[in-house]
Each structure stands twice: as structure tokens, then as C-alpha cells.
């Protein structure tokens, strides 16, 4: 029961996390313009991974996508890649984990298969969460670096007909959404991995071993057993040791001089 609850909770937490990663990736508020020391306080600029937006105090908002792919900073491209990888891995993980849920029965799927699928999805969620956290952190680092560089260059002169305005960007809402979502996906993945351990079959297989007495066809079956654990459990009645002992599944052989009582 605890295993099912852990697995189910892990799935739900990961689902919320991945939804958050998708939301963060699509959001425009990755960086917001710090309006301190800005001449036009009525205009507010915020930028995302895919487009830039301008909002005015009047309520007017205009958003436009970035033109070039090659002209954009390498760091921004890296963040885009990390977020997309996180979403893809998370989506695959969700798909795998649906079939791995203990409460869902699909044909004659064994617990060992479900355990493997739970572990796989758990690892995928962990990597997905790490990708999201890494992506958001790289972007945040880029903002912090740019912020201090901008502060240093704040009072540059006119510089001819075109002057670069040292606008300072600060953390947008998407960064916090991304960090929380990545963390949730990571936690969900860990929970799935924990649930996997409980799903792994820890069977005690009682082997019925046939002993053949010389000249008799009576099979004596003692209560010998072998406990096995883990994925590699001896689920089929295989030969445990050589000698006169045969498993019940094996064909009865004729008595030989090597058989003993």
C-alpha cells in the first residue's frame, strides 16, 4: 500500500513539475527591466526565451519574437536547449510511469517489469528536473553578470548617433517558476526510484526437489528451500545443485548407481 502511495505521489509531483517546466519555458517574464534610473518610467520591458515584450503603464502591451537564431547569445540558446531536453525527458518519463503505476493493470505485466519502468521514469524525472534547474540557473547567472556590467557602464556618453542604453534586467517570474518546477520534478523522480525498490519482487521460492531411491519409483520431497531477492530471482524452478537431486519440472529418470537414498 505504501509503495503504491509513494509511486502515485511521485507521479503527481512529477506531473506538476513538468507542467511547471513547460509553463516556465513558454513564459515571457524570464528577465524584467529594472526601472531604476530609467528615463522613461512609463515603459516596462520584459523578455523571455522566445520573444520580447513591452508593457506601458496605460496597459498597452506589444510582444515580438526574436528575429535571428544565430544573432542570439550562445547562453540563451543553451538555456533553450536545456529546457526543451527537460520537457522531452519529462514527457517520456510521464508516459513510461503511467504504464508503471501499480494501480493500473495492463495485461499480464509482471511486478519486475513495473519496477524497471518505475526506475526508468524516476531517472528520467531526475534528469528532467536537473535540466530545468540548470537552464534557469544559467539564465540567472547571465542576468547577474549583465547587471553588474551594466551598472559599471551606466554613465557612458552619447557615443554618436546610436547609443547603447545600459538597461539593467532583473529576475523575472519565469525563473522562480522554473526553479520550483525543476525541484518538484526532481523530488517526484526520487520518489519513483524509492517506489521502485518496494515494487521489486522479493520472493521466497520453495523448491520441491525430487530424490530417487535406488530401485524405487517413489519421489521423496523434503521441505528444502532457497530464498532469493532482487530482480534476478529464481522464479522458474531451475536446478539448484547437481547430483541425484532433480527438480519436479525435470523428467523423471530411471534409477542409476549414482542415486542414493
Amino acid at each position: 500500500m505504501a509503495v503504491t502511495a509513494c509511486q502515485g505521489l511521485g507521479f503527481v509531483v512529477s506531473l506538476i513539475g513538468i507542467a511547471g517546466i513547460i509553463a516556465a519555458t513558454c513564459m515571457d517574464q524570464w528577465s524584467t527591466q529594472d526601472l531604476y534610473n530609467n528615463p522613461v518610467t512609463a515603459v516596462f520591458n520584459y523578455q523571455g526565451l522566445w520573444r520580447s515584450c513591452v508593457r506601458e503603464s496605460s496597459g498597452f502591451t506589444e510582444c515580438r519574437g526574436y528575429f535571428t537564431l544565430l544573432g542570439l547569445p550562445a547562453m540563451l540558446q543553451a538555456v533553450r536547449a536545456l529546457m526543451i531536453v527537460g520537457i522531452v525527458l519529462g514527457a517520456i518519463g510521464l508516459l513510461v510511469s503511467i504504464f508503471a503505476l501499480k494501480c493500473i493493470r495492463i495485461g499480464s505485466m509482471e511486478d519486475s517489469a513495473k519496477a524497471n519502468m518505475t526506475l526508468t521514469s524516476g531517472i528520467m524525472f531526475i534528469v528532467s528536473g536537473l535540466c530545468a534547474i540548470a537552464g534557469v540557473s544559467v539564465f540567472a547567472n547571465m542576468l547577474v553578470t549583465n547587471f553588474w556590467m551594466s551598472t559599471a557602464n551606466m554613465y557612458t556618453g552619447m557615443g554618436g548617433m546610436v547609443q547603447t542604453v545600459q538597461t539593467r534586467y532583473t529576475f523575472g517570474a519565469a525563473l522562480f517558476v522554473g526553479w520550483v518546477a525543476g525541484g518538484l520534478t526532481l523530488i517526484g523522480g526520487v520518489m519513483m526510484c524509492i517506489a521502485c525498490r518496494g515494487l521489486a519482487p522479493e520472493e521466497t521460492n520453495y523448491k520441491a526437489v525430487s530424490y530417487h531411491a535406488s530401485g524405487h519409483s517413489v519421489a521423496y520431497k523434503p521441505g528444502g528451500f532457497k530464498a532469493s531477492t532482487g530482480f534476478g530471482s529464481n522464479t522458474k524452478n531451475k536446478k539448484i545443485y547437481d547430483g541425484g537431486a532433480r527438480t519436479e519440472d525435470e523428467v523423471q529418470s530411471y534409477p542409476s548407481k549414482h542415486d542414493y537414498v
Epitope: 528577465s31 522613461v40 512609463a42 515603459v43 520591458n45 523578455q47 520580447s52 513591452v54 506601458e56 503603464s57 496605460s58 496597459g59 498597452f60 506589444e62 515580438r64 526574436y66 528575429f67 535571428t68 544573432g71 542570439l72 547569445p73 540563451l76 549583465n146 548617433m161 546610436v162 547609443q163 547603447t164 542604453v165 538597461t167 534586467y169
Partner: nanobody, 120 residues
């Protein structure tokens, strides 16, 4: 590259009117604000009037009620209608545009300037 071409300056009598025009060309994400600044001989450059993409305008106290700024976003032009001109308004008028050029790249683009002389 973004470029601004301003025009419409000249000599005018006190109390007269003049219309300044400015056209922007090039590629950008957002033309955040367009406006006019002026610089009188021996003085600092000062804001005259500014207008945002949404049409919100702001004026210097000295020109309020006399000057009117308007903008055509489709043609990327800004015009400054100057009425009841005074000799104090004599200056070189510069067109300005604040542009979001690309990802976290904001530019202040300036026109070459047009001289307005108001005679008493």
C-alpha cells in the same frame, strides 16, 4: 542598423507655428518611445516631448499646451507640432527613438538634428 531622419526646421516669427517630422528605418523588436529633445547654444540637451508605442505622451513643462506630439506606428514616424513659438524655443531639435533591438539590447538612436530659429 536603425536610422532616424528628422526634418522641418527653419526660421519662424515669434507666435508662429512649425511642424517637425522624423522617420525611422531599419530592423528592431520594439520602437519603445519616439520623441524630441532640444539643445540651445551653450545649454544641455533637454527633453521636449516623448510618445510611447501605445500613444502615451509626456511633455516638458515649458512646452505644455503649445506643442503636440503624434506618432504613426505603421510608418514609424513621429511629428512635433509646435504652436505659439517663443524666442526661448530656439535650439537644435533632435529626434530620438528608444529601441529594443534584440535580446537584452536596448539602443537610443538619434537623428542628425534640425535647427529651429524663432525671431522676435
Amino acid at each position: 542598423a536603425v536610422q532616424l531622419v528628422d526634418s522641418g526646421g527653419g526660421l519662424v516669427q515669434a507666435g508662429g507655428s512649425l511642424r517637425l517630422s522624423c522617420a525611422a528605418s531599419g530592423i528592431w523588436l520594439h520602437m519603445v518611445t519616439m520623441g524630441w529633445y532640444r539643445q540651445a547654444p551653450g545649454k544641455q540637451r533637454e527633453l521636449v516631448a516623448i510618445i510611447t508605442s501605445g500613444g502615451s505622451a509626456d511633455y516638458a513643462d515649458s512646452v505644455k499646451g503649445r506643442f503636440a506630439i503624434s506618432r504613426d506606428n505603421t510608418k514609424n514616424t513621429v511629428t512635433l507640432q509646435m504652436n505659439s513659438l517663443k524666442p526661448d524655443d530656439t535650439a537644435v531639435y533632435f529626434c530620438n527613438a528608444r529601441v529594443v533591438a534584440d535580446f537584452q539590447k536596448v539602443l537610443d538612436v538619434w537623428g542628425q538634428g534640425t535647427l529651429v530659429t524663432v525671431s522676435s
